[in-house]
Amino acid sequence: GITNINCSGHIWVEPATIFKMGMNISIYCQAAIKNCQPRKLHFYKNGIKERFQITRINKTTARLWYKNFLEPHASMYCTAECPKHFQETLICGKDISSGYPPDIPDEVTCVIYEYSGNMTCTWNAGKLTYIDTKYVVHVKSLETEEEQQYLTSSYINISTDSLQGGKKYLVWVQAANALGMEESKQLQIHLDDIVIPSAAVISRAETINATVPKTIIYWDSQTTIEKVSCEMRYKATTNQTWNVKEFDTNFTYVQQSEFYLEPNIKYVFQVRCQETGKRYWQPWSSLFFHKTPETVPQVTSKAFQHDTWNSGLTVASISTGHLTSDNRGDIG
C-alpha cells in the first residue's frame, strides 16, 4: 500500500488516520529532503492532485483541509517541488479511513442446529461502520462462573464440546473499532432450549384425480427430536399473501400433507419446524414449486425440479393441522 513507500518526510492526519465520517480533517505534509527547500508542496488523493484548501504552514510543512469528509477510504500522498529538480519529489503517503463507531449489538441470538456440533451466535450489528470492526462474544457459565471469549468479524460458531460449564449460560457481544466500543445486553440461554431440528425438506408433490382433486406434499426431516412443531406455507405465485398450515409432527416417516388447490395454477410451498414449545424456528425451506393440472391427469413435482434461485437453509415439516393466513414472511 501507500504506507510502504520510502519517505523523505512525514505525513499525518488530524484528528487521526481513522476518523468519524463527515468530520473536517487536516492532512499535514512535512518535507525532509536533502538540499530541497520546497517551493511548493502538493497533495494527491487517490492519485489526483488537490487544488484547493492547501495552506503553507512553514518552510517545510503544508496543510490540506477537507470539510465533511465522506469517503470510507482514500490513499493520500504528498510531493515537493524542489528547486533544480526536474520533477516533483515524493515525500510520503498514508491510507486514511472514515467511518462510524459501532452501534450497540442487539438481537443477540444463539442456536444449535441439530447435528452441527456448534452453537451459532448472531446479532444485529447495526449500521455499517465502514472500518474494521471486531466483535468479542462472551460466554459465561451460570453454574461455574467461567467465562470464555471469542473474537470474530461477524457471527461465531462455538463448538458445543467447549461448553463444559453445564447447560445455562450468559452470552453478550462487545463491538469495537478505532472509533469506539459498545456492548450488548446479556442473553440468558439454556442449551436444551436453543436446538433447531434438522432441516425439513419438501421432496415432491402430486395432484390426485378425485371427485375434488387434491395435492399431496411429501416432506421429511432427519431430526431425532421427538416433539416437533412445523408450519407449511403456500400461495399461488401470483399472490402476495401466504396461507399457513400448522402441524405437530413425528418424523418417524415421510410426512404427507393434503391441499385442495385451484386447477392450472403454479403454487409455491415452504416449510419450517421448531422443537415444540421452544423459541427458535428453522429458516423457511427452499421454495418448492408445483403447478396443478388443468383437468384430470395425475401430475407429480419432485424436489429436484424446484427453482434454485432462492435457497437458504431448508427446514420444516407437516402432517395435519389448521389453516391460517400469513402476511408476515419469515418468523424469527
Epitope: 518535507a31 536533502k34 527547500q37 520546497p38 503553507r56 512553514n58
Partner: antibody, heavy 116, light 107 residues
Framework: QVQMVQSGAEVKRPGASVKVSCKVS????????IHWVRQAPGKGLEWMGG????????IYAQRFQGRLTMPEDTSTDTAYMELSSLTSEDTAVYYC?????????WGQGTLVTVSS | DIQMTQSPSTLSASVGDRVTITCRAS??????LAWYQQKPGKAPKLLIY???SLESGVPSRFSGSGSGTEFTLTISSLQPDDFATYYC?????????FGQGTKVEIN
C-alpha cells in the same frame, strides 16, 4: 522570480551587535530557506548559516555559534542576521541568499564596518 | 568542516581560450557542488549546480564535471564578460564551505 533587498551599510564599535535585514518578495519566507554569507574586503566567500530543509532547522557555522542568530518575521517576509560581540575581523559585506542548495538568489549585500 | 581547495588561485588567459579550474574536497561530497561567478562589488552568481547542471540563463560555454572529491569548471571559449573570480561550494554537509576562489584575469 525572487527578489532580496537588504538594509543599508552599518558602522559599529567593537563589542557591539549588528542586525541586517533582508526583505524577500516574489515568494514568502514560508517557501524560502534563507542563508547568510559574508565576504571580508579582498577575501573569499564565507557561509555563516542557513535553513536546513532536511532537518527543518537553522544550522550555524561552528565559528559563529553563540553570537549569530537568524530570526525571521513571516508577516513582513523579512529575514534578519544578528551578529553580536563584533570585532574588526567582522568587517565584511554580508549577503542574504536563497534558495537552499545551491544559492541561486542573492541580496545586493550590506557592508558592516567595525571600527573604534 | 569539509575543506575546499581551488586551483589555480589566479589564472591569466585571453579571449577565446579554453579555461579549466579545479576544486578538490577534503572528503567525498557526491555531486553536491556548485560554481559561482563574482565580479567586483557584486553578489555572486550561480553558474553550475550538482557538479554538472547548468543554471538557467547561463551560457553553454560553461560546463562542470566530477564527483566525489575532484571537480572541474570549464569555460570552452573565454569571453570578455567572463573575467571575474570563480568560487566552488560544497553543499553536501553543513557547514557549507567555499573554495578560496580563482581569479581569471586578462593575459
Amino acid at each position: 522570480q525572487v527578489q532580496m533587498v537588504q538594509s543599508g551599510a552599518e558602522v559599529k564599535r567593537p563589542g557591539a551587535s549588528v542586525k541586517v535585514s533582508c526583505k524577500v518578495s516574489g515568494y514568502t519566507l514560508n517557501e524560502l530557506g534563507i542563508h547568510w554569507v559574508r565576504q571580508a574586503p579582498g577575501k573569499g566567500l564565507e557561509w555563516m548559516g542557513g535553513f536546513d530543509p532536511e532537518h527543518g532547522k537553522i544550522i550555524y557555522a561552528q565559528r559563529f555559534q553563540g553570537r549569530l542568530t537568524m530570526p525571521e518575521d513571516t508577516s513582513t517576509d523579512t529575514a534578519y542576521m544578528e551578529l553580536s560581540s563584533l570585532t574588526s575581523e567582522d568587517t565584511a559585506v554580508y549577503y542574504c541568499a536563497t534558495v537552499a542548495a545551491p544559492l541561486d538568489y542573492w541580496g545586493q549585500g550590506t557592508l558592516v564596518t567595525v571600527s573604534s | 568542516d569539509i575543506q575546499m581547495t581551488q586551483s589555480p588561485s589566479t589564472l591569466s588567459a585571453s579571449v577565446g581560450d579554453r579555461v579549466t579550474i579545479t576544486c578538490r574536497a577534503s572528503q567525498s561530497i557526491s555531486s553536491w557542488l556548485a560554481w559561482y561567478q563574482q565580479k567586483p562589488g557584486k553578489a555572486p552568481k550561480l553558474l553550475i549546480y550538482k557538479a554538472s547542471s547548468l543554471e538557467s540563463g547561463v551560457p553553454s560555454r560553461f560546463s562542470g564535471s566530477g564527483s566525489g572529491t575532484e571537480f572541474t569548471l570549464t569555460i570552452s571559449s573565454l569571453q570578455p564578460d567572463d573575467f571575474a573570480t570563480y568560487y566552488c561550494q560544497q553543499y553536501d554537509i553543513y557547514s557549507w564551505t567555499f573554495g578560496q576562489g580563482t581569479k581569471v584575469e586578462i593575459n
